[in-house]
Structure formats: C-alpha cells, structure tokens
C-alpha cells in the first residue's frame, strides 16, 4: 500500500524542497525529477563528494527510490552507486544500513541515461530529510528521481487532483465560466495546473457556487489544499470557504467545528498553496467547496488530502 510517488515527478515536492552540494551549470537540484524532459533535465555535478537532499516537510515513510540518469548530447550521465542518509530534524543524520547494524548499504543505481532503477528500502525509512550521496558515476553525478512511500500517519496523501488519479468526470460544479477561447471548467481545479484557463471559475461570483469531487468510494479526508490563479495582471483567489460532504450526492452536511459551521481561511495570494486540516476528519464519498469571499473573481485550484477508508481497518 505504501508505495505512492511522493511528488518529485508530479511537482508535489516543490523546487525549494530540493537542494544539493552544488550543480554543474544549469543542471539544478530542482530538475532531479523522474521522467523530466528537455535539453537540461536533471541535477548534475562534477564535484567528487556531492549530495542531493529532499526535504519532505514532514516525517514520511519512505519505502524506496527510483533513479534515472540523463543525456547530454552523445554522453550518458548517471549515478551507478550511491548511499542514502536520512534525518528527522535535519541535524542528526543516519546512514541507511538496511537490516545490518554494521556496514552502510551501497545501492546499485543506473547503467544508462534513460532506464529507471527501483531500489527498495527494507526496512523502510522514517524521515523528513533524505540525502543521496553518489559514490560511483558515469562522467558526472547526474540524477532524476522519485521517492516512493506514504505519509507517516498514512492519511494525508494527495488523493489525486494534481496527479489526475481523480478523473475530470469526478469533478463537477454548480456552474463554470466560459469566454472566447477559454473554459474554466471544474476539471481545471487541479493544484499547480498550468495553461491559459488553469482553474475552476464559476459563471457568476456568489456564495451559492460550489465545486464538487466524487471519490467514487468512501474516503477519509483529512485536509484540503487550495490555490488561486493569476492572469497577466489580475490575481484571483478564494479567501474563505465552507466544506460540505455527502455519501449519496443528495443529502449534504456542512463541516462543523466546535458546534458551528467552520469557515476555512483560504488563500492570500494567487499562487501559494494553503493547507487546511479537517479535524475531525471526514468519512465521505462526495466533497464540496463553497467559496464565501474572494479577491476579484472566484478561482480555485485544489488538492484533497486523505486516504482510503478501508486503509483504517
């Protein structure tokens, strides 16, 4: 179960979370994402004792790592062997040794520039920070990677808005805005979506509008991440919203906290994702977001956090 990509490829792990000892030219740490494409499409360094670090922002269970090299013109660049270090606080570091208490474990990495090598951590690592240290490489230490695992409490993983595991058909709304050559449909309400009309916008701006996600089965929802959007000059975002839930899509219950309807504090700009936790969590099939106040226009990109309800038993 705990084999979810943690977000290197999808971008759920943001650029600022990825740092390194150094870089070769423009081959920056933020490019170290599995399947990344382009002429400069990986982290690379010439330094002999280099490292790349990922800050997962919270402790996670890490079950494995997928690695990939890259090409530069006619050269294959990759890391053939590496060691892993990890930390909960960023200060006290441990070297991964597998089941042994003695020698550190050297992982065998890639043999070419494009193949993906999946190394399993058995036992899994529990850490916030992961350090990868190349020990052998071809030409330069060069890396694209994905971390595989799950949240420590196993229930605040992205449920699929950004990754599209939640399909377009599962996202509906009270209405949506269309203009010449632009459609701000419900399926555009995906965290970090790019493009011309890259958010949901309702036909009219009023507090009766809503965006709905159908998970198609009962899920435990522990939080929502919201984001606004910016056109060339105009920032649009939702400042406050309500949440309602339903098991059948007909009878809806607003989310209460301390005996009253909870008004969630949303975004303060058009680009920064804001996470709101649901305490207590919701067990629901359907979830609705009801914007209550906004800047310029209602515009929403979002992710839902949680896990499958059956994972709890």
């Amino acid at each position: 179960k705990c084999q979810t990509p943690l977000g290197m490829a999808s971008g759920h792990i943001r650029d600022f979370q990825i740092t390194a000892s150094g870089q070769y030219g423009q081959w920056a740490p933020k490019l170290a994402r599995l399947h990344y494409s382009g002429s400069i499409n990986a982290w690379s360094t010439k330094e002999p004792f280099s490292w790349i670090k990922v800050d997962l922002l919270a402790p996670m269970i890490i079950h494995g790592i997928k690695t990939q090299g890259a090409r530069q013109k006619f050269s294959s660049l990759y890391i053939s062997q590496f060691i892993i270090m990890y930390s909960l606080d960023g200060k006290k570091w441990q070297t991964y040794r597998g089941n042994s208490t003695g020698t550190l474990m050297v992982f065998f990495g890639n043999v070419d520039s494009s193949g993906i090598k999946h190394n399993i951590f058995n036992p899994p690592i529990i850490a916030r920070y992961i350090h990868l240290h190349p020990t052998h490489y071809s030409i330069r230490s060069t890396l694209r990677m994905e971390l595989m695992g799950c949240d420590l409490n196993s229930c605040s993983m992205p449920l699929g808005m950004e990754s599209k595991a939640i399909s377009d058909a599962q996202i509906t709304a009270s209405s949506y805005f269309t203009n010449m050559f632009a459609t701000w449909s419900p399926s555009k309400a995906r965290l970090h979506l790019q493009g011309r009309s890259n958010a949901w916008r309702p036909q009219v701006n009023n507090p009766k509008e809503w965006l709905q996600v159908d998970f198609q089965k009962t899920m435990k929802v522990t939080g929502v991440t919201t984001q606004g959007v910016k056109s060339l000059l105009t920032s649009m975002y939702v400042k406050e919203f309500l949440i309602s839930s339903s098991q059948d899509g007909h009878q809806w219950t607003l989310f209460f906290q301390n005996g009253k309807v909870k008004v969630f504090q949303g975004n303060q700009d058009s680009f920064t994702p804001v996470v709101n936790s649901l305490d207590p969590p919701l067990l629901t099939r359907y979830l609705r977001i009801h914007p209550q106040s906004w800047v310029h226009q209602i515009a929403l990109r979002m992710e839902v956090l949680g896990c499958e309800a059956q994972d709890l038993y």
């Epitope: 269309t178 203009n179 010449m180 060339l232 000059l233 105009t234 649009m236």
Partner: antibody, heavy 117, light 108 residues
Amino acid sequence: QVQLVQSGAEVKKPGASVKVSCKVSGYTLTELPVHWVGQAPGKGLEWVGSFDPESGESIYAREFQGSVTMTADTSTDIAYMELSSLRSDDTAVYYCAVPDPDAFDIWGQGTMVTVSS
Amino acid sequence: EIALTQSPGTLSLSPGERATLSCRASQSFSSSYLAWYQQKPGQAPRLLIYGASTRATGIPDRFSGSGSGTDFTLTISRLEPEDFAVYYCQKYGTSAITFGQGTRLEIK
C-alpha cells in the same frame, strides 16, 4: 510590463489591402487571444474579430466576414489584422486588445487607417 | 446578436455630482459578460468594470457597476474632473462581442 505596440498610420486607396500589426511584450503571444476593435472618426467602438494564436482559430464580426483575416507570428510575438477590398467607410482607428482575465483590459495605442482615393 | 443601447446619449453634470449611466440589452444575458470602458479623446479605451460589478485593477472605488438580465448601470459616486469622457458598455463572451453606442459625460 505588459504592452501592446501597434504599427504606424496607413493611407490606402479603395480596393487595396492593409495589414496592421500588434507586437506584444511582457508575456508570450500564445497565452491569450487577441481582439481587434475599430473606431471610425467621431463614432463608437466596433468589434472586428478575435484571434487565438495558440490554436489559430478566429471569430469575425458578421460585418467584416470576407474582408478581414487575422493571423499571428508566434516566433516574434506579433499579431496581424489584414483588411482587404478597402472602402472609404473602413477609415478608422484600429485597436488590438487582450483580455485579462475576461474583458479587454490591455489595449494597443491604435493604428489610423485612412482609405481615400 | 445582442444589441446594447446606452442612455442618455449625453450627460451634463458638475464635478462632485453623482453620474448614473444605463445600458440596456435587446435580450437577457449573464452579468458575467458585461463590461464598462472609459475613453478620452485620442486615447485607447480603458477597462473600468467587468462581470457587471468587478472593478478592474487600479480603478478607483467611486466607479461601481450593477445590474443583471437586460439592465445594467455604471455609477460614478462623486465626479472628478478627469472622469469627463465617453463611456461604453460591452457584451463579451463565447461568441459575438458588441458595444453600446456610448454615453458622453460632459462638464455642465
């Protein structure tokens, strides 16, 4: 800074054609559609048509269908509006404009097209 | 195609007064698609209001828009000398775009 800079004034004879350009800066042309609006001397605003540089799709006002063609060169970030079979009543200032986010928020400075024999 | 009729054609008022400009559509449409522009001589139009009531970036709050269906209004609460200009309403959206014929706001 987002700007639309249009080509200079033109004087044309009836029956001729004119091609007005609109150079965008501060963003990439394919990000937004380009709308064209005409204004005859002392008159109101009249929508000519709209062009989507991303898809190449255009929508023209009924009055201009058959006489207007909108194109773009995405490598130089320039949109074009060509009017053919010019008549004296095509004499107007022509503006390009882009929506941000919906209505026409950003405008070019206008290009005066004079049709006179 | 929806036609927009603006009234009055000319409005004569003094600075400090309240201006109310009307825009009537030949058939009902969503207020999401109604905009107001200001144009001064020799200048390109300037967007004031879109979505019938949302002020464009940088527009002073003395400008406000309202209305729905077929009747829309632009209100300038206290006229400043720089507000005297021609005002146009516009219906935009997924197909044909239309402008009203304009209201000239002049100093009395």
